[in-house]
Interface confidence: low
């Protein structure tokens, strides 16, 4: 199915307009911001739902890499160019010439430049490590129940593949999931390891994306596993190109 | 709506300078670069340089540096072209054209109505 | 710089007929291609952007296709007002380059 056909809607993103305008009067929808006809089978493009968010407050993280090449988004919200296929575009600037590059999440992957600045091609991000930490508990969480826990959530929520989820790592009260997923393995069909990522970073916050559906309920072993805060590092296929006034 | 209106017709001697105005009108001046392009009689389009009207910061193509100014002045929407040392080879019809700022905006979407510039002696 | 090469440099078409200009650019400029028709003695008027976008009140037979360096503006059935000097041009990095234009003529 493309949307849900009894009251025309998209399950997978809330942040669309539907009508029964498709093929036999079938329900379409497409994306606010950009206009783009979305699958709602499965998840939106994270460029795509980056678009229909462009008027939300900027939110900004800053805390240290786990390794030299790994990327944080410091950048926060902006309008992304999105290609037909809904990915990002190489290169994105803003509104008053100023232009970067970006990995396939839409990270900035470079300094800024002006229109001279050349992208030659979409740099994957074939590994996001997700670093939470919870609230306190009454004791740590088992581990083999939470890892259990969270790959169930990536395979039936965000409909990634369980080879994608790599590992989960926990020592209370740090929670680590490893994401990772090459261009080779990536078929036709798969869930992207950043639509995923930005979808669960979304729920994560309070900020579900999905029509209809409660916020995220967390429960390993029935007890609930508050997030109190999450920052996601981004590893590209080949590394990012900053100038050493960045790195220092 | 939206025009573009340029400084008439000006005629040169090889050596001087020349200074073509685009007044822009009907949009805030501000939210859209002023591109600058020529055509020389019978030929193609070639691109000049622009300005960033919200910031002032002109950009120059490398055959035109050290000969051309690209100025605003915002309090009249007017953006101005300045080329000097002029030859005969810079006879040529001067157009400005508005253009947008991000990443997918670098198309012309109004012109004025273009400036013959004659270098003759 | 990209160059931005047309084909082909002139041709006559009837009214009525589908007629297709082919603009080829020498780097990939992703889907950065804008298409203009020029009348003698006036400024040019924007067609096409982002390749495949008519611009406000472009009627739709014309229409633009194409991505990477291989560019197509197609009309779709001749217009008397359409006969024209038409350029591409390569929004896509500094310094900012058209073709060398195609002369559509009546035949």
């Known amino acids: 199915h493309t949307a849900a056909q009894d009251n025309c809607t998209c399950p997978t993103n809330k942040m669309t307009v539907c009508s029964p305008d498709g093929p036999g009067g079938r329900c379409q929808c497409r994306a606010l911001g950009s206009g783009m006809a979305v699958d709602c089978s499965t998840l939106t493009s994270k460029c795509l739902l980056l678009k229909a968010r462009m008027s939300a407050p900027k939110n900004a993280r800053t805390l240290v890499r786990p390794s030299e090449h790994a990327l944080v988004d410091n950048d926060g919200l902006y309008d992304p160019d999105c290609d037909p296929e809904g990915r990002f575009k190489a290169r994105q600037c803003n509104q008053t010439s100023v232009c970067w590059c970006v990995n396939s999440v839409g990270v900035r992957r470079t300094d800024k430049g002006d229109l001279s600045l050349r992208c030659d091609e979409l740099v994957r991000t074939h590994h996001i490590l997700i670093d939470l930490r919870h609230r306190p508990t009454a004791g740590a969480f088992n581990h083999s129940d939470l890892d259990a826990e969270l790959r169930r959530l990536f395979r039936e929520r965000y409909r990634l593949h369980p080879k994608f989820v790599a590992a989960v790592h926990y020592e209370q009260p740090t929670i680590q999931i490893e994401l990772r997923q090459n261009t080779s393995q990536k078929a036709a069909g798969d869930v992207d390891i950043g639509d995923a990522a930005y979808y669960f970073e979304r729920d994560i916050k309070g900020e579900s994306l999905f029509q209809g559906r409660g916020g995220l309920d967390l429960r390993v072993r029935g007890e609930p596993l508050q997030v109190e805060r999450t920052l996601i590092y981004y590893l590209d296929e080949i590394p990012p190109k900053f100038s050493m006034k960045r790195l220092t | 709506q939206v025009q573009l209106v340029q400084s008439g017709a000006e005629v040169k001697k090889p050596g001087a300078s020349v200074k073509v105005s685009c007044k822009a009108s009907?949009?805030?001046?501000?939210?859209?670069?002023m591109q600058w392009v020529r055509q020389a009689p019978g030929q193609g389009l070639e691109w000049m340089g622009w300005?960033?009207?919200?910031?002032?910061?002109?950009k120059y193509a490398e055959d035109f540096k050290g000969r051309v100014t690209i100025s605003a002045d915002t309090s009249t929407s007017t953006a101005y072209l300045q080329l000097s040392s002029l030859k005969s080879e810079d006879t040529a019809v001067y157009y400005c054209?508005?253009?947008?700022?991000?990443?997918?905006?670098?198309?012309?979407?109004?012109w004025g109505q273009g400036t013959l510039v004659t270098v003759s002696s | 710089d990209i160059q931005m090469t047309q084909s082909p440099s002139s041709l006559s078409a009837s009214v009525g007929d589908r007629v297709t200009i082919t603009c080829k650019a020498s780097?990939?400029?992703?889907?950065?291609v804008a298409w203009y028709q020029q009348k003698p003695g006036k400024a040019p008027k924007l067609l096409i952007y982002?390749?495949?976008y008519r611009y406000t009140g472009v009627p739709s037979r014309f229409s633009g296709s194409g991505s990477g360096t291989d560019f197509t503006l197609t009309i779709s059935s001749l217009q008397p007002e359409d006969f024209a000097v038409y350029y591409c041009?390569?929004?896509?990095?500094?310094?900012?380059?058209f073709g060398q234009g195609t002369k559509l003529e009546i035949k």
């Open positions: 054209a508005r253009s947008g700022f991000g990443s997918s905006y670098w198309y012309f979407h109004v």
């Open positions: 009907g949009y805030t001046f501000t939210t859209a670069g």
């Open positions: 300005i960033n009207t919200h910031s002032g910061v002109p």
């Open positions: 780097q990939d400029v992703s889907t950065a």
């Open positions: 982002s390749a495949s």
């Open positions: 041009q390569q929004h896509y990095i500094t310094p900012l380059t």
